[in-house]
Amino acid sequence: KSPIFGPQEVSSIEGDSVSITCYYPDTSVNRHTRKYWCRQGASGMCTTLISSNGYLSKEYSGRANLINFPENNTFVINIEQLTQDDTGSYKCGLGTSNRGLSFDVSLEVSQVPELPSDTHVYTKDIGRNVTIECPFKRENAPSKKSLCKKTNQSCELVIDSTEKVNPSYIGRAKLFMKGTDLTVFYVNISHLTHNDAGLYICQAGEGPSADKKNVDLQVLAPEPELLYKDLRSSVTFECDLGREVANEAKYLCRMNKETCDVIINTLGKRDPDFEGRILITPKDDNGRFSVLITGLRKEDAGHYQCGAHSSGLPQEGWPIQTWQLFVNEESTIPNRRSVVKGVTGGSVAIACPYNPKESSSLKYWCRWEGDGNGHCPVLVGTQAQVQEEYEGRLALFDQPGNGTYTVILNQLTTEDAGFYWCLTNGDSRWRTTIELQVAEATREPNLEVTPQNATAVLGETFTVSCHYPCKFYSQEKYWCKWSNKGCHILPSHDEGARQSSVSCDQSSQLVSMTLNPVSKEDEGWYWCGVKQGQTYGETTAIYIAVEERTRGSSHVNPTDANARAKVALEEEVVDSSISEKENKAIPNPGPFANEREIQNVGDQAQENRASGDAGSADGQSRSSSSKHHHHHH
């Protein structure tokens, strides 16, 4: 008796595909050992056809795969383009050799069944319509025409030319003739359901001279398309329902035992479990639309169905399309926090993962908006200028080659709370979602800039200092000049950091920036920040106004811009954003959204294209020199 379990008999038709699931006992060894599918020969030897080690036999090339789902203790063998030669005895099993734990599977592939030559077969999907063609001889032209459905004993009328209609076909069946052709009539049945499947007879005339035709109507539930996605990646359901439902509301639902629960529809309904990580996008006027879900979770696996109906809900007899989604926990996408916490006035540094093989791809950051069908307008990108309302407080730092780029948002307000997406114009699986939560600040910020009334005088020397707590002592401090193409890190040397220091005076830690001489181009937003290697931490922003010298005073009143210049995170969040061990502010690719929407995101980015390297240290130059001084008092 084998502890492996699966289907003992699998029967299919030539040209179709099979998906065989084998279940194994829940042990660590089983989860990680080799999985195989082999064919038993007459000698009793079992020849490997495919294994989880990457082996694929010649006869399975391009038409089979084997996927392990360790979280479910299952593995799945998918075989497409079946032929009768695939009929035989197989084993699915575990172990380094094919003599390990296994289960016997018998696969039978039959020819497509033939019907008597006088039977016309119509094969239609659920929800579609069929037009049955019924030829007759000219002498039966004046006679009654009818279509009936065969039951065990009799043939039950569906519709006839005297306008009699079976109650279950009212509003769905039409009998008509085309033009002047008096040798054929047609019956159209719409909104097909499984109950409509069966044998029909169309007839013109009565008695022995009547014209009869046998019809076999097959109504198929669409075969689920199998989708295999990694944990934390994204999936797009491309739904093509046809022109006849182009004007109906569209939906995506997930089978939940007896019902199909709507996840999202075009009437504004959205399941709270998918908040911030889903979009539905109408593609065109032909009834095509797509639904994108990102930040896939283990519990997202299941049977999905898309459809169209004015109610935005599943309805029998309306076209559908189905998918079986598998979520593989052996994911290439790094596990990061999906929630980032900040405080009002503070800042967050969000590390966005991307496929390291696509380091030259364009990086974007957009804000998910749930209104309507949902959309995600780009706020910043490697070649997309920062949106105006984020002036001075948002920048994207690309770190080519290491699979991460960082987005920093400071001067936080409670309005900034919500869902944001990291995406690139490359591998769409790597789109990730971050939920930003913003709490009211309860303490002083960690980074503080003085003077806060930052007005520099043209031609003079102007110094601003950034005070930081001792816990940032060992970290790299930087100043950067913000522009809508990024925040250009200014050349610096941190003198104090080179001096050995046993104690740290909480009141005296500062890094200064000096503009000498001040020029008009120096006006703008400056950020003071801390980082450790490529891991960015807290920032604070200050607006420096530049004015000409006025008689009597070299300083003028502070600008309004600095009302929001003091920024910081809660202390524990600062720790985590810098510390290698506890990357609390490095988010997990949480929830997400849709293919066409991402296309829009891309289009928007094209519109916003600007010269220069957004967020890179060498993308721009400064007219004034600046130094970082680390003062000890």
Epitope: P7, S17, I20, A221, E223
Partner: nanobody, 127 residues
Framework: QVQLVESGGGLVQPGGSLRLSCVAS????????MAWFAQAPGKEREFVAA??????????YYADSVKGRFTVSGDNAKKTLDLQMKDLKPEDTALYFC??????????????????WGQGTQVTVSS
């Protein structure tokens, strides 16, 4: 209203045969998996056999204890399920339940993976 109705149960001698049938009505889907479970007095419900459909492909599953003796068959479109039982043994005595589920995923041996259940038909194997 959803109904699964089993029939064909009865009293049979060891070594004898029986054919159980189940008809589902009112299901909101063309069932993608149907199964037979047996519950002997004072015992848990146990998996006997199942059939799953995906398109034109069918998958038949059996418990080790019935392999070679029982044959499951069914019609997805008609929502019917049959169990041909041969070489019956006294330990096959139980109440046999028919179960249905909208899709063919999850372990077919686990009763919690089925949404709809019939009332059961009694099979007694005794001399």
């Amino acid at each position: 209203q959803v109904q699964l109705v089993e029939s064909g149960g009865g009293l049979v001698q060891p070594g004898g045969s029986l054919r159980l049938s189940c008809v589902a009505s009112g299901l909101p889907f063309s069932s993608s998996r149907m199964a037979w479970f047996a519950q002997a007095p004072g015992k848990e419900r146990e998996f006997v056999a199942a059939i799953g459909w995906r398109g034109r492909t069918s998958y038949k599953y059996y418990a080790d204890s019935v392999k070679g003796r029982f044959t499951v068959s069914g019609d997805n479109a008609k929502k019917t399920l049959d169990l041909q039982m041969k070489d019956l043994k006294p330990e096959d005595t139980a109440l046999y339940f028919c179960a249905a589920h909208p899709n063919d995923d999850g372990d077919p041996r686990i009763s919690g993976n089925y949404q709809y259940w019939g009332q059961g038909t009694q099979v007694t194997v005794s001399s």
